[in-house]
């Protein structure tokens, strides 16, 4: 018995294509690239029907439906734009992922363009079906920092967003009587990591043992401008506290530490990471100008004892900053060796300040970042961490501030963070 003539579906074909079909003949219905066979609301690659003894076909011819990749996956810290009109998500449609600039940028300079493939998945030429990654930009404040004229600016108020990497670290040990509470500064390196000085996070013991404070006792504030108003700031608890294993409490050698935040912080105009320098044992060049910010000493007559006894009271409500030149290593070493007391300026430190002293040359909290503008990448790089200074008041003549030389610890920092791609590489453009 002969079965009726078959019409292939729109965007499809039937095989074999014959003039006549008889009992037991079978045909395979398939669709063009980018289309799927649809039968009873079920999608399939092919569908077979057979000519029955009574001259009818075993099934109706199915339809061919265009492949739909459906709504593309959400991109963390990213946006999606549809290149095809009506926001189509069907075969050959195109979408573009982009990152929330200027706070995030796409890893590997990916185009972010994805096309709906015949298989029904969004595909990128390089990444395939994997989504791109948006990584934090570093060292680019939303407000441009002041031009580095060679003059100290003592205790100047920092505008909000000028130091978006600045973190206030508050340590409160409630297990001790009376409660121990102190503060320091740090610098945001990625959405999850803060760089600071080890002595800020060392448990305050009377002996020389180096034990980190319990992570439960650490709170980090980011995007903070005025300590009296923490409402606009992001506060985070610590997931990990990592002190450099060789930190020496007696001479403050290797005074560097990291805090991993409990949750990654959202970046924005007031919260952005600073860039790490290239590993460079020489450290920053003498006479280069850097900036240090902090809620610390803004009164040149405050002594170290007074700072310690002030407890949690920060000495400045609004974030202050100062501009300081790097001091030649030999000069700084000599200035400390000439003092009574056992001062050791090691190869893991550098000094900054002015010979003549002056107001606020040691402004800034322990652990705060000494940042230098890197001409190569056009970004701010953390070259130092506020570490220690002489016994005299802030700003005394020839008492330079001593900073941890961050560029000696690049490998250590990366190793602790364990995520080579958690910090974006600074783009360097001609």
């Amino acid at each position: 018995n002969e079965c009726p003539e078959l019409q292939p579906p729109v965007h499809g074909k039937i095989e074999p294509s014959q003039a006549k079909y008889f009992f037991k003949d079978q045909v395979l219905v398939s669709c063009d690239t980018g289309y799927k066979v649809l039968k009873d609301n079920v999608e399939m690659d092919t569908f077979q029907i057979e000519c029955l003894k009574d001259g009818t076909w075993s099934n109706k011819i199915p339809t061919c439906k265009i492949v739909d990749c459906r709504a593309p996956g959400e991109l963390e810290h990213g946006l999606i734009t549809f290149s095809t009109r009506n926001n189509l998500t069907t075969y050959k449609s195109e979408i573009k992922y982009s990152c929330q600039e200027p706070y995030y940028k796409m890893l590997n300079n990916n185009t972010g363009i994805y096309t709906c493939s015949a298989q029904g998945v969004w595909m990128n030429k390089v990444l395939g079906r994997s989504l791109p990654t948006c990584l934090p930009e570093c060292g680019q404040p939303s407000r441009s920092l002041p031009s580095l004229v060679k003059r100290i600016i003592g205790g100047r108020n920092a505008e909000p967003g000028l130091f978006p990497w600045q973190a206030l670290i508050v340590v409160e040990d409630t297990s001790r009587v009376p409660n121990d509470k102190w503060f320091g500064s740090g610098a945001l390196l990625s959405a999850s990591w803060i760089l600071t000085a080890a002595h800020v996070l060392r448990s305050q013991r009377r002996d020389t043992t180096v034990i980190p404070v319990s992570k439960e006792h650490v709170t980090v504030y980011l995007g903070l401008h005025d300590v009296r108003d923490k409402s606009g700031a992001v506060n985070s608890s610590a997931a990990r506290v990592v002190l450099h294993p060789d930190f020496n409490i007696q001479n403050y050698n290797h005074d560097i530490a990291l805090v991993q935040l409990q949750e990654p912080v959202p970046l924005g105009p007031h919260v952005m990471p600073v860039c790490l320098p290239r590993l460079e044992p020489e450290g920053p060049a003498p006479h280069m100008l850097g900036l240090v910010a902090g809620w610390g000493i803004s009164n040149p007559n405050v002594t170290v004892d007074e700072i310690i006894s002030s407890g949690t009271r920060t000495l400045s409500d609004v974030l202050q900053y100062v501009k300081l030149p790097v001091v030649p290593h030999a000069e700084c070493k000599t200035s400390y060796e000439s003092r009574s007391g056992n001062y050791s300026v090691t190869e893991n430190m550098f000094c900054a300040g002015y010979y003549e002293g002056g107001k606020d040359t040691c402004l800034g909290d322990s652990g705060g970042a000494f940042v230098i503008f890197d001409d190569l990448s056009q970004r701010w790089v953390v070259q130092g961490l506020v570490s220690w200074g002489g016994p005299e008041e802030c700003g005394s003549k020839q008492v330079y501030g001593v900073y941890t030389k961050v560029s000696n610890y690049v490998d250590w920092v990366w190793e602790q963070m364990g995520l080579p791609q958690s910090v974006v590489e600074p783009q360097v453009e001609r």
Epitope: R278, P281, S377, E425, Q427, R430
Partner: antibody, heavy 120, light 107 residues
Framework: QVQLKQSGTELMKPGASVNLSCKAS????????IEWVKQRPGHGLEWIGE????????NYNENFKDRATFTADTSSNTAYMQLSSLTSEDSAIYYC?????????????WGQGTLVTVSS | DIVMTQSQKFMSTSIGDRVSVTCRAS??????LAWYQQKPGQSPKALIY???YRFSGVPDRFTGSGSGTDFTLTISNVQSEDLAEYFC?????????FGSGTKLEIK
């Protein structure tokens, strides 16, 4: 994934110049230093120098400063090293390499090497 | 320039043994030292950086130690695939310099 693909074997005459290429893929080319390393049998490895493709900044080993020139084409993600005034001492395998992190100075990724033979 | 000395050009070992390759710097390089493995006809591969950090994917039988001027690469439970040449490299000062290499051979 990070890949560095180097140009093929070169047979050169003494006094000539050779231009070696190193095509990078799988990362942001402009942000990482490209290192060049020479290896002669029985002479171990010798660092020639480095270039930061994004800025064109270079650092050379004094032993090669007068004869090696590094360039980078950011449109094709390719770094080049030109070595001039070749002698038989320059017969070696030349590698390009890249650090793991943008801030590091040890070499995590290496090209397959280009063999240069200098012979009259 | 900083001279990196690998005094042993060859070292004989047996499968399953523990072997230590040493490297000495002519001046203090801090922790800024890397170890590489190179097999015949292949490019060098990074094993250890910052004197003691193992590069990703490197088996934990490879350990690095030392700081300043004296460094050691230790391979415990040597496997046949470890037979190769090992180079140290300082990256503390320009120019970066490599040791002359130590070849690991089977007894």
């Amino acid at each position: 994934q990070v890949q560095l693909k180097q140009s093929g074997t070169e047979l050169m005459k003494p006094g000539a110049s050779v231009n070696l290429s190193c095509k990078a893929s799988g990362y942001t080319f402009t942000a990482y230093w490209i290192e060049w390393v020479k290896q002669r049998p029985g002479h171990g490895l010798e660092w020639i120098g480095e270039i930061l493709p994004g800025s064109g900044t270079t650092n050379y080993n004094e032993n090669f400063k007068d004869r090696a020139t590094f360039t980078a084409d950011t449109s094709s993600n390719t770094a080049y090293m030109q070595l001039s005034s070749l002698t038989s001492e320059d017969s070696a395998i030349y590698y390009c390499a890249r650090s793991y992190y943008y801030a590091s100075r040890w070499f995590a990724f290496w090209g397959q090497g280009t063999l240069v033979t200098v012979s009259s | 320039d900083i001279v990196m000395t690998q005094s042993q050009k060859f070292m004989s070992t047996s499968i399953g043994d523990r072997v230590s390759v040493t490297c000495r710097a002519s001046q203090n390089v801090g922790p800024n030292l890397a170890w590489y493995q190179q097999k015949p006809g292949q490019s060098p591969k990074a094993l250890i950086y910052s004197a003691s950090y193992r590069f990703s994917g490197v088996p934990d039988r490879f350990t690095g130690s030392g700081s300043g001027t004296d460094f050691t690469l230790t391979i415990s439970n040597v496997q046949s695939e470890d037979l190769a040449e090992y180079f140290c490299q300082q990256y503390n000062r320009y120019p970066f310099t490599f040791g002359s290499g130590t070849k690991l051979e089977i007894k």
